[in-house]
Amino acid sequence: MAVTACQGLGFVVSLIGIAGIIAATCMDQWSTQDLYNNPVTAVFNYQGLWRSCVRESSGFTECRGYFTLLGLPAMLQAVRALMIVGIVLGAIGLLVSIFALKCIRIGSMEDSAKANMTLTSGIMFIVSGLCAIAGVSVFANMLVTNFWMSTANMYTGMGGMVQTVQTRYTFGAALFVGWVAGGLTLIGGVMMCIACRGLAPEETNYKAVSYHASGHSVAYKPGGFKASTGFGSNTKNKKIYDGGARTEDEVQSYPSKHDYV
């Protein structure tokens, strides 16, 4: 039960995290105009990974895309790449983890396969989260560097007669969304990896033997202490192929129409 909960929670946390990474990547407010210690302007600038925007006091907002690829700073390209890799890995991880969820049965998928898929998705979530955190951190570092550079030569001009105020940029909302989302994806991935350990079957897989009695069938399972009788709705003799004890909620049932997703 704890394994199912851990896996389910890991999936949900990762899902929220990846949604956040996508949102952060699309957001325009990666960097916003620094208003502290600056002349109050009637124009507010903010920039994203894909476009820069200007919001006027009039309420008019104008956004311009970065229509060049080669002219953009290498760091910005690197951040874009990290975020996209994070999203792609996260999306694949989500897809894999859906099939790995214990609460969803696909045919007669082995527990070992589910365990492997859970581990795979967990690793993908961890890498996805790290990519997002790295991308956001690289951008933040770039901002800090530029901030202090522009502060050092904030006022430039000919002989100090004419002043040109350089626009300084500080952390935008997208950075915080990205950090939190990356962290959530990372935590979700760790949870999936933990869940994988609980899902993995025992190392010793004994073949169960079926003894046929004349009256009713009694299957003796070497791995467990419980003898399962043939009494019940299904009176056919059953072969038990899996060794090792199973909890009640793990007893395999015949596939029903609801089992195929």
Epitope: V40, T41, Q47, S52, C53, S58
Partner: antibody, heavy 118, light 113 residues
């Protein structure tokens, strides 16, 4: 078309108060800011400040903080300028203007002359 | 506050001749975010409210005759009336729309010679 219609001229005594109105029509009133501009006789234009009809937020130029108050009645698409404790130097024509894209004043009221005299 | 300095104070030009008004700002009005200069030009005739001619330093307001043109960037701007008409007699103001408080130039009176 966009129109800003201001109230008529006012003659006031020093120390009195005056309220100038600016009625907007031809556009969605809450979408654009209303600015107030003063022009003393024979002088240039002075920006007093503006009010955002969407939020009610106001911004005043330093010399117009205190006795000058901008307000709104969005139900009748009207902006108001109230001046209290009037002084002789407040004698001027007061204009309201709509703040449009490009932070430009694209439409102006006809102006309201406020004369302060004892 | 940003100081807007207009020159000359008054200008007398013959009909059909070119009139040029200059405006200098104490700080750059160029916004790096959209590469626009937040400067507007207004025309005011006696007894009338100002009328917008140019915004973003060089964009002509709709309905304004094309003899009016604006140029310049950063701190230095120019309003040009390519061929002065009798109805152009007025006072012209430049106004910066980038920093609070928004400020106007002192005005330039254009007359016919």
């Amino acid at each position: 078309q966009v129109q800003l219609v201001q109230s008529g001229s006012e003659l006031k005594k020093p120390g009195a108060s005056v309220k100038v109105s600016c009625k907007a029509s031809g556009y969605t009133f809450t979408n654009y800011g209303i600015n107030w501009v003063r022009q003393a006789p024979g002088q240039g234009l002075e920006w007093m400040g503006w009010i955002n009809p969407n939020t009610g937020e106001t911004t005043y130029a330093e010399e117009f903080k205190g006795r000058f108050v901008f307000s709104l009645d969005t139900s009748v698409s009207t902006a108001y300028l109230q001046i209290s404790s009037l002084k002789a130097e407040d004698t001027a024509v007061y204009f309201c203007a709509r703040l449009y894209y490009g932070n430009r004043f694209d439409s102006w009221g006809q102006g309201t002359l406020v004369t302060v005299s004892s | 506050d940003i100081v807007m300095t207009q020159s000359p104070d008054s200008l007398a030009v013959s009909l059909g001749e070119r009139a040029t008004i200059n405006c200098k700002s104490s700080q750059s009005l160029l916004n790096s975010g959209n590469q626009r200069n937040y400067l507007a030009w207004y025309q005011q005739k006696p007894g009338q409210p100002p009328k917008l001619l140019i915004y973003w330093a060089s964009t002509r307001e709709s309905g304004v005759p094309d003899r009016f043109s604006g140029s310049g960037s950063g701190t230095d701007f120019t309003l040009t009336i390519s061929s002065l008409q009798a109805e152009d007699v007025a006072v012209y103001y430049c106004q910066q729309a980038y920093y609070y408080p928004l400020t106007f130039g002192g005005g330039t009176k254009v007359e016919i010679k």
